[in-house]
Interface confidence: low
Amino acid sequence: LCQGSNYSTCASCPSCPDRWMKYGNHCYYFSVEEKDWNSSLEFCLARDSHLLVITDNQEMSLLQVFLSEAFCWIGLRNNSGWRWEDGSPLNFSRISSNSFVQTCGAINKNGLQASSCEVPLHWVCKKCPFADQALF
C-alpha cells in the first residue's frame, strides 16, 4: 500500500498511528523531548519514518501553523549545498544561517534556520499513513 518508499506520496492512504497527526496526505510526529539532529533522525528511522522533508511551500505553511518561534529539527542538511534527506535540493525557501558550522536545518513558525547539529531541539518526523494502526 503505502509502505514502500519512505518518500512516496500517500494520496489515498488511511489513518495515522497513535501519537501521530494526519495533515494532508501524511502523518507527522511532533516530539515531546529534545535531541540532537542525528538522534532525531535515528528516532524517526526506527519508526519507519524520516525527519521531516518538506516538498513545497504549501506543506511548509501548513506545518508552521503548529509551531512556535522555537526550532525543531527537520531532514535538511548542508553538504555542499542544502539538501533534504531524500536527496532533493532546497529550492522553494530560503534558510537563515549565522555560521558555516551550522549544517543542520530546523524550522519554526517563521521559516527555516541553520543550526549546529549538536544542539538539542524538538524534531518532526513524517511518514505515510498505514492501513493497520496496530503496527505501532
Epitope: 503548529f66 512556535s68 522555537a70 524538538h122
Partner: antibody, heavy 121, light 107 residues
Framework: QVQLQQPGAEMVRPGASVKLSCKTS????????MHWVKQRPGQGLEWIGK????????HYNQKFKDKATLTVDKSSSTAYIQLNSLTSEDSAVYYC??????????????WGQGTLVTVSA | DIQMTQSPSSLSASLGERISLTCRAS??????LNWFQQKPDGTIKLLIY???SLDSGVPKRFSGSRSGSDYSLTISSLESEDFADYYC?????????FGAGTKLELK
C-alpha cells in the same frame, strides 16, 4: 537571564476588577507563550490560560473564560491578566509562567514569584 | 478535561531516603508530563519535562518514569533542600491540568 517580575500583593474590594502585571526581561518576549496559573491558599495549582505575545492568540481554561482576560504590551515586554467581578473565591496567588517550544506541547521552565490577590471588604 | 490523580498527598521521609511520587492520568497523555517543585516561599521550579527529561540545573537524584498511565517522580537520596511541595502537570491537551500536589516533609 530570564526574569518574570510580578508585584507582591494586591488588595481589592469584592465586585471590583484587578489587572496584574508580569514584566519580562532576558529573552525575546514575543517568542514564547505566557501562561497564568492560580493557587488558592493551601491549595494546588490551576491553569488559567496562555497567550502568544507575538499575535495575542489566547487559549483559556473554560473555567476561567468569564473571569480572566489575558493581554500583552509588546513595547514593555509585559503580560497582563485582568480578573473581574472579584469574590473571595478569587483570593489566591497568581503566577505567570513562560512556555516553550511547540504550540501543542507546553511546559514552564520559568515562573514569576506570584502576586497575592486578597479580595476583602 | 484530563484528571491527574497524584499520590500520596503527603509523605514524611528521612534524609538519604529514596522516595517516589505518582500521578495517574485519566486518559492517554502520550508522555506529555512535567514535575514541578514548590518551595515554602512560593517559588516554583521545573524539574522534569516530557516524562523523563531533566531540566537544566536539576540534580541527577531526580528522575522521571512512566508505566502505562502512571507517571512517577523519584528522588534517589533525599537532601534537605528537597522538602517541598511537588506537582505534576499534563500538557497533552487543553486545559492543562495539575495533580493536587504532594507535600514532602522531613520525618
Amino acid at each position: 537571564q530570564v526574569q518574570l517580575q510580578q508585584p507582591g500583593a494586591e488588595m481589592v474590594r469584592p465586585g471590583a476588577s484587578v489587572k496584574l502585571s508580569c514584566k519580562t526581561s532576558g529573552y525575546t518576549f514575543t517568542s514564547y507563550w505566557m501562561h497564568w496559573v492560580k493557587q488558592r491558599p493551601g491549595q494546588g495549582l490551576e491553569w488559567i490560560g496562555k497567550i502568544d505575545p507575538s499575535d495575542s492568540e489566547t487559549h483559556y481554561n473554560q473555567k476561567f473564560k468569564d473571569k480572566a482576560t489575558l493581554t500583552v504590551d509588546k513595547s514593555s515586554s509585559t503580560a497582563y491578566i485582568q480578573l473581574n467581578s472579584l469574590t473571595s473565591e478569587d483570593s489566591a496567588v497568581y503566577y505567570c509562567a513562560r512556555g516553550r517550544l511547540l504550540r501543542l506541547r507546553d511546559w514552564f521552565p520559568y515562573w514569576g514569584q506570584g502576586t497575592l490577590v486578597t479580595v476583602s471588604a | 478535561d484530563i484528571q491527574m490523580t497524584q499520590s500520596p498527598s503527603s509523605l514524611s521521609a528521612s534524609l538519604g531516603e529514596r522516595i517516589s511520587l505518582t500521578c495517574r492520568a485519566s486518559q492517554d497523555i502520550y508522555g506529555s508530563l512535567n514535575w514541578f517543585q514548590q518551595k515554602p516561599d512560593g517559588t516554583i521550579k521545573l524539574l522534569i519535562y516530557g516524562t523523563s527529561s531533566l531540566d537544566s540545573g536539576v540534580p541527577k537524584r531526580f528522575s522521571g518514569s512512566r508505566s502505562g498511565s502512571d507517571y512517577s517522580l523519584t528522588i534517589s537520596s533525599l537532601e534537605s533542600e528537597d522538602f517541598a511541595d511537588y506537582y505534576c502537570l499534563q500538557y497533552a491537551s487543553f486545559p492543562l491540568t495539575f495533580g493536587a500536589g504532594t507535600k514532602l516533609e522531613l520525618k
